[in-house]
Amino acid sequence: IWELKKDVYVVELDWYPDAPGEMVVLTCDTPEEDGITWTLDQSSEVLGSGKTLTIQVKEFGDAGQYTCHKGGEVLSHSLLLLHKKEDGIWSTDILKDQKEPKNKTFLRCEAKNYSGRFTCWWLTTISTDLTFSVKSSRGSSDPQGVTCGAATLSAERVRGDNKEYEYSVECQEDSACPAAEESLPIEVMVDAVHKLKYENYTSSFFIRDIIKPDPPKNLQLKPLKNSRQVEVSWEYPDTWSTPHSYFSLTFCVQAQGKSKREKKDRVFTDKTSATVICRKNASISVRAQDRYYSSSWSEWASVPCSGSGSSRGGSGSGGSGGGGSKLRAVPGGSSPAWTQCQQLSQKLCTLAWSAHPLVGHMDLREEGDEETTNDVPHIQCGDGCDPQGLRDNSQFCLQRIHQGLIFYEKLLGSDIFTGEPSLLPDSPVGQLHASLLGLSQLLQPEGHHWETQQIPSLSPSQPWQRLLLRFKILRSLQAFVAVAARVFAHGAATLSP
């Protein structure tokens, strides 16, 4: 038994036929010693007398509000809730399995940007006697603060004969660092109480993995003279992180009729305009995704082909990013070839994802994960890799990136990747290895030495352990190269001489 909040206790029960249940001792919160009686809920039946009451809790009939009285006056209450465990698994009766992205997904979370603000939601078919309370933190062993509001009913839907209720909650990391590479996941814990049943649900994620931008705004069409083509332009959504030269998006532009089965014209671009063929009765849609990290695509923003007006959304500055005057070269060190570094780091992002594309289908955060991936270098908040830090002195950040590149280059050349099960030299991992080396050499020309970090001795003995470790390393590398790519893109746009 444990205390959920003041005067509310959760009794954990193994739930099987003829289970013995749990012995619970309740103590009346009073200085009084004599003449105390106990009742349950609205019943006037006296269950016992004395300052303590010992009960055997086996089923929901044994749970409820226990009240101690003296001479008709209520002294204190203790609400007992039951948390059922069947076959070693805690019950999940209150919330609906959303089955996306995988089975046993009860909580789903999304973030519109890297500010540390995110929304989680869940579904239930229960309409009454239902309460939720949400807690969150960054990391679990030494948790950093995340503040969550109250869960609210956000939608009601009819599903066949049933009504389905969606609840949501907004949370904000207290000291968010949008430009840093996350090393500890956000933990979200939801306590759910239905009548006398208690359940808890958890989710663990990095903000980068739950990013889903808002749709592009200000979609506009300009027909091209003597052509079937139209120029489509749009802007970054207002809610996306800034500056856009650092937090860049990529876009998918599609011209298609009302039915998904109709023929279409489709093109991908990093710019905020594109040229497509616009058929009568078709519409043009644009959606956005983080340019350097394969999180979710936004919903589509659409405009009909017939009119060449603009879609919903206010006007605002264009989202091509970059903007502003060119900034001075790096103080205290030579400036890197920003554009070359940008191209190579973007290639690294692509390679990192083709080397390990099945990211969403494998949950790598199980036992022992923190030890294996805490050893890899992360681009942290104080490393100067944010836009302001780069402007002040990019050398700190470049040195950190260089250390990471050398570290991962050595890891990819180590027994973890060269041992069984074997990889061929020109697999994406082989290309990744070569590109890491190439970028590190671009950053540190001959005769210029930065200190490098010691490689940890991660030598798994079993092939399956090696395979798991590879996935974890590649997963971590994807996050590292995404930050590096943002740094070089921003540098190329604002710091190139």
Epitope: R228, T250, R261, K263, D265, V267, F268, D270, R279, S354
Partner: antibody, heavy 118, light 107 residues
């Protein structure tokens, strides 16, 4: 399944015109874009243009503009490509292809060899 | 127009080995890049679309990667039926253009 069957080989004199046909089956003709791509002997692939059978819209590669005409007959589910003022370097295999997506080529015809020789 | 350059022009590989074919665009084309296989006397066949998307019915040994200006087609373990000419094609802008092709031959 989606199939494209092209007309037979042609031999033409320089300055003449050729009209190659491409009969589609296995799908609703107006549901796919149709492209023409050619390949000179021992050479690579060269895109010529596309037509939308639904409305007759066309887009031609600048190299062929003014010399090529693409048409369709929806009643027979057939596409045509006519190339005028033939030169010897127009000797090639001409392919039609169809796709629901405009910018790449999914289903190909078997090709029609056009030889331009005096 | 966008010029597509493929390398090498010829690649000699033994059956069972891995083949890596490169395609470079004269300007950034995002992921608007597609790969085709052509065997002698046959029409080309689409292998990969939008740089890395696989086509149903195409063996899993064919994979694509890249974005921007550099792209790669990888055949993980060459089978006898894979010896052919491979073309890349950009769809970033009209006119649509192809690379000159890479001939994969038996070593």
């Amino acid at each position: 399944q989606v199939q494209l069957v092209q007309s037979g080989a042609e031999v033409k004199k320089p300055g003449a015109s050729v009209k190659v046909s491409c009969k589609a089956s296995g799908y609703t003709f107006t549901d796919y874009y149709l492209h023409w791509v050619r390949q000179a002997p021992g050479q690579g692939l060269e895109w010529m243009g596309w037509i939308d059978p639904e409305n007759g819209d066309t887009e031609y590669a600048p190299k062929f503009q003014g010399r090529v005409t693409m048409t369709t007959d929806t009643s027979t589910s057939t596409a045509y490509m006519e190339l005028r003022s033939l030169r010897s370097d127009d000797t090639a295999v001409y392919y039609c292809n169809a796709n629901k997506e405009l910018r790449y080529f999914d289903v190909w015809g078997q090709g029609t060899m056009v030889t331009v020789s005096s | 127009e966008i010029v597509m350059t493929q390398s090498p022009a010829t690649l000699s590989v033994s059956p069972g080995e891995r083949a890596t074919l490169s395609c470079r665009a004269s300007q950034s084309i995002s992921i608007n890049l597609h790969w085709y296989q052509q065997k002698p006397g046959q029409a080309p066949r689409l292998l990969i679309y939008f740089a890395s998307q696989s086509i149903s019915g195409i063996p899993a040994r064919f994979s694509g990667s890249g974005s921007g200006t550099e792209f790669t087609l990888t055949i993980s373990s060459l089978q006898s039926e894979d010896f052919a000419v491979y073309y890349c094609q950009q769809s970033n802008s009209f006119p649509l253009t192809f690379g000159g092709g890479t001939k994969v031959e038996i070593k």
